[in-house]
């Protein structure tokens, strides 16, 4: 959706929410992908009847994309060439580089619960390493 704003930073974070928070966010967890390839970041909010007004996707403290219930998708200008909306409320990262390694957050803005935050750790591997089956893992 063609929002009329420049690129800007969002604020990451983990947790928070209303006193009656019952929901949980399931994510793809710790994942790895090959340099130059693509990866889908997925979160799913369950176990709550809260209304989802907006989902923000953030990397560290940078806003990547927004999916708004009224307006649909907006991709931040500095990421528009490498980020695609979907599938669903997920986000597809393309043309991956080693610099894309790091934490990603899906932030669900809901009513009346408040904010739910899911975390995904992505490691982008050099092609030769990926071909040999190496995978990033956090114990």
């Amino acid at each position: 959706y063609p929002y009329d704003v420049p690129d800007y930073a969002g604020g990451g974070g983990s947790g928070g929410g209303g006193s009656m928070m019952t929901g949980t966010i399931e994510t793809t967890g710790n994942i790895s992908a090959e340099k130059g390839g693509s990866i889908i970041l997925q979160c799913h909010l369950s176990s709550t009847t809260a209304q989802v007004a907006q989902v923000n996707w953030e990397q560290q403290d940078q806003l990547l994309a927004i999916c708004n219930a009224d307006l649909g998708w907006h991709i931040s200008p500095s990421f528009k060439d490498r980020v695609a909306p979907g599938p669903g409320l997920g986000l597809t990262l393309q043309s991956l580089t080693v610099n894309d390694t790091g934490e990603y957050f899906c932030i669900y803005h809901t009513y009346p619960d408040g904010t739910y935050t899911g975390r995904i750790f992505l490691e982008v591997l050099e092609s030769s390493v990926a071909e040999h089956g190496a995978r990033f893992q956090i114990p």
């Epitope: 969002g10 604020g11 929410g17 209303g18 923000n56 009224d70 307006l71 935050t117």
Partner: antibody, heavy 119, light 107 residues
């Protein structure tokens, strides 16, 4: 330049009604959620109501729920607050404010309109 | 509802002073806290959101820190135009709630 201009305030008797308006300019109004926030004389700020860009999400403070109605007309770049069954404790300056696109705070505010509820 | 408690309620300071205002939430709000400045007869102005992110156009002498329940607004070198009332506000859940305000006066 983003501008928000409130109007419609005034003196009203307890139990009466008033409709506040907020005229928006300088941005694409239909892309942004909007709030009403009030401030009683000499007091702090109190959030009143929120409406999302396309009106699918509407939230109220418990103190006004059932008495106040927030609405918007994107074609007219206008936000409204219909206030019924007014009480003395509703006396305040009422501000309209724009929600940041990322839903993280209110980034632009109008100058406010004064509502006085008194007999 | 989440209660937001600001301290001090007022303070006196001189131009050039470093000023610190604190805000405490009655329960964790992660990083979702905003700070506003309000001058008499004027509308509030957003300074900081998400705990530490400076709103565009706000001078870098303003900074925010904290997460969970305890937050701080710091003005590194107070300027004449900074004498005002400052409010914190949690934007983690509805109803959004504000602190009672801190009035920064000239010493």
């Amino acid at each position: 330049e983003v501008q928000l201009v409130e109007s419609g305030g005034g003196l009203v008797q307890p139990g009466g009604s008033l409709r506040l308006s907020c005229a928006a300019s300088g941005f694409t109004f239909s892309n942004f959620g909007m709030h009403w926030v009030r401030q009683a004389p000499g007091k702090g700020l109190e959030w009143v109501a929120f409406i999302s860009s396309g009106s699918s999400s509407i939230y109220y403070a418990d103190t006004v729920k059932g008495r106040f109605t927030i609405s918007r007309d994107n074609a007219k770049n206008s936000l409204y607050l219909q206030m019924n069954s007014l009480r003395a404790e509703d006396t305040a300056v009422y501000y309209c404010a724009r929600m940041r696109l990322d839903y993280y705070a209110m980034d632009y505010w109008g100058q406010g309109t004064m509502v006085t509820v008194s007999s | 509802d989440i209660q937001m408690t600001q301290s001090p309620s007022s303070l006196s300071a001189s131009v050039g002073d470093r000023v610190t205002i604190t805000c405490r939430a009655s329960k964790s709000i992660s990083k979702y806290l905003a700070w506003y400045q309000q001058k008499p007869g004027k509308a509030p102005k957003l300074l900081i959101y998400s705990g530490s992110t400076l709103q565009s156009g706000v001078p870098s002498r303003f900074s925010g820190s904290g997460s969970g329940t305890d937050f701080t607004l710091t003005i590194s070198s107070l300027q004449p135009e900074d004498f005002a009332t400052y409010y914190c506000q949690q934007h983690n859940e509805y109803p959004w709630t504000f602190g009672g305000g801190t009035k920064v006066e000239i010493k």
